[in-house]
Amino acid sequence: GALEVQVPEDPVVALVGTDATLCCSFSPEPGFSLAQLNLIWQLTDTKQLVHSFAEGQDQGSAYANRTALFPDLLAQGNASLRLQRVRVADEGSFTCFVSIRDFGSAAVSLQVAAPYSKPSMTLEPNKDLRPGDTVTITCSSYQGYPEAEVFWQDGQGVPLTGNVTTSQMANEQGLFDVHSILRVVLGANGTYSCLVRNPVLQQDAHSSVTITPQRSPTGAVEVQVPEDPVVALVGTDATLRCSFSPEPGFSLAQLNLIWQLTDTKQLVHSFTEGRDQGSAYANRTALFPDLLAQGNASLRLQRVRVADEGSFTCFVSIRDFGSAAVSLQVAAPYSKPSMTLEPNKDLRPGDTVTITCSSYRGYPEAEVFWQDGQGVPLTGNVTTSQMANEQGLFDVHSVLRVVLGANGTYSCLVRNPVLQQDAHGSVTITGQPMTFPPEA
């Protein structure tokens, strides 16, 4: 008879830049040896070879050297594939083809996703506004995938659908930048909110702008930064937004701009004497020189690290002075948890087992939840430890001690509190006696 190959029914969702595991398992017969196994992972639609195992040997990756099997688990029937540094172009269906004597295959879908940045809001015109003026509010959110859904609403939560134009452009990596434009006639004052939704991650990124039409008071330079922290994924680039309103006749020769760490005054980047003085922060910062004259003093911070987290002050002096601080919140998604069982064979109801759930390289520290097959939380006999590596990323290990019933499913959920990203793993223990793992 045909060989039964099992893969998850639901698509595997993976964040761009992270690693994904495409689970695939088969049930080896007694006396099975790896010399008998022929395993092929291929793209379902094109049959392009991705990875193979034959003649008792891992034949390696045929897919940009970004794939790996789990060699220690193959003999137990675990044919799962690890895909590293996921890209948008990886999205699609992968077939796991196993032949021993009989043949079996199954396809698993990979759904790629990337969270959208917190939207930035710009206003045109942006000064001397009076009730009755028509303004254009632009909401821009960057580097997300797949395409976003964009919603506008007013301060009372009423949707604004008229006079909205939304465009989405993919960059070289396939990530989308979304720009949505709302044209509105100003009342006495008003709040306008833009929500950018990632339909796969069910992640909502929102920003709002409150417009009080009147002349700004003269005197100090009004420097504007986002109220909410800027959330940036480790390894990506972040824009710390800062703007001021240049007066008529303003020239860059008059501008003195300093970005510094709020708590230490450590210089990050400066612009003086009409010139960009460059980065004083590990050469990972840049201004937007073409936009400075319009009052855009934003700072681009490249290849964000955990150590970058904190408050940055944007200090502007022309004749008057102005400054404001913006917070950078660094985040990294946790990997899909791996589950291990101790002891892992000849298990019977009444046995006490230790289930370990491990998830890697996330930030900030995770929240870990356990539950049984009915969704009932398991809080007793849980020990969770989190250790930071040299880059400040956390590996989380949570251990549940449980007495086995006739059968049972145990699920572990690792939540990133900043990204509101949940990574879960589960193990189902059935029958008696049994051996773990029965599948990936």
Partner: antibody, heavy 118, light 109 residues
Framework: EVQLLESGGGLVQPGGSLRLSCAAS????????MSWVRQAPGKGLEWVAG????????YYADSVKGRFTISRDNSKNTLYLQMNSLRAEDTAVYYC???????????WGQGTTVTVSS | QSVLTQPPSASGTPGQRVTISCSGS????????VNWYQQLPGTAPKLLIS??QRPSGVPDRFSGSKSGTSASLAITGLQSEDEADYYC???????????FGGGTKLTVL
């Protein structure tokens, strides 16, 4: 009215210790960096030490590093300067100054005199 | 020796215009705010000018300017009560210290 009032100065022997205080009023103390500046008799102004809003970052002049400690208690609106291993050259009027976001020491106290002599 | 360089003395007659210079470097005056303080005999220093901005209460006879790594304080219509010591100061983000000029003693003849 915005005010800074220093206290704790006096006569001390070389090698001795002294703790200066600066009581702030009329503004939100915890929103500002603060500094100590001194002036030896007949000489110019010399910055001594500075501290950030929450006390987590401190900076010192080379001449006092390792001997003086700046600290603050935001709940009491008070700035401190703990001076140990005092030397004759530390004799001066010590001023506390508010250090605003624009790198301006805009408000100064009236000063307290420290004399180090045997 | 001070990090910021000022002339030790300046003088003028009532009604005259005098200027006091202050020279620094790119890590202080070059990109940071330059402050001018007036110290009358026996009193605490008082903020006079920041770059070119006067705090309220400072007469408009006092003005400041900054160019590159140098700054200057100008006093027009000199008055006898202007006789004092004048200091320039700036935060230095390389040294992580405030730096002062040595002070200029202004005499009204």
């Amino acid at each position: 009215e915005v005010q800074l009032l220093e206290s704790g100065g006096g006569l001390v022997q070389p090698g001795g210790s002294l703790r200066l205080s600066c009581a702030a009023s009329g503004f939100t103390f915890s929103s500002y960096w603060m500094s100590w500046v001194r002036q030896a008799p007949g000489k110019g102004l010399e910055w001594v030490a500075g501290i950030n809003r929450n006390g987590g970052t401190t900076y010192y002049a080379d001449s006092v590093k390792g001997r003086f400690t700046i600290s603050r208690d935001n709940s009491k609106n008070t700035l401190y300067l703990q001076m140990n291993s005092l030397r004759a050259e530390d004799t001066a009027v010590y001023y506390c100054a508010r250090w605003n976001d624009y790198d301006i020491m805009d408000v100064w106290g009236q000063g307290t005199t420290v004399t180090v002599s045997s | 020796q001070s990090v910021l360089t000022q002339p030790p003395s300046a003088s003028g007659t009532p009604g005259q215009r005098v200027t006091i210079s202050c020279s620094g470097s790119s890590s202080n005056i070059g990109r940071r705010t330059v402050n001018w303080y007036q110290q009358l005999p026996g009193t605490a220093p008082k903020l006079l000018i920041s770059n070119s901005q006067r705090p309220s209460g400072v007469p408009d006879r006092f003005s400041g300017s900054k160019s590159g790594t140098s700054a200057s304080l100008a006093i027009t219509g000199l008055q006898s009560e202007d006789e004092a010591d004048y200091y320039c100061a700036s935060w230095d983000d390389s040294l992580n210290t405030w730096v002062f000029g040595g002070g200029t003693k202004l005499t009204v003849l």
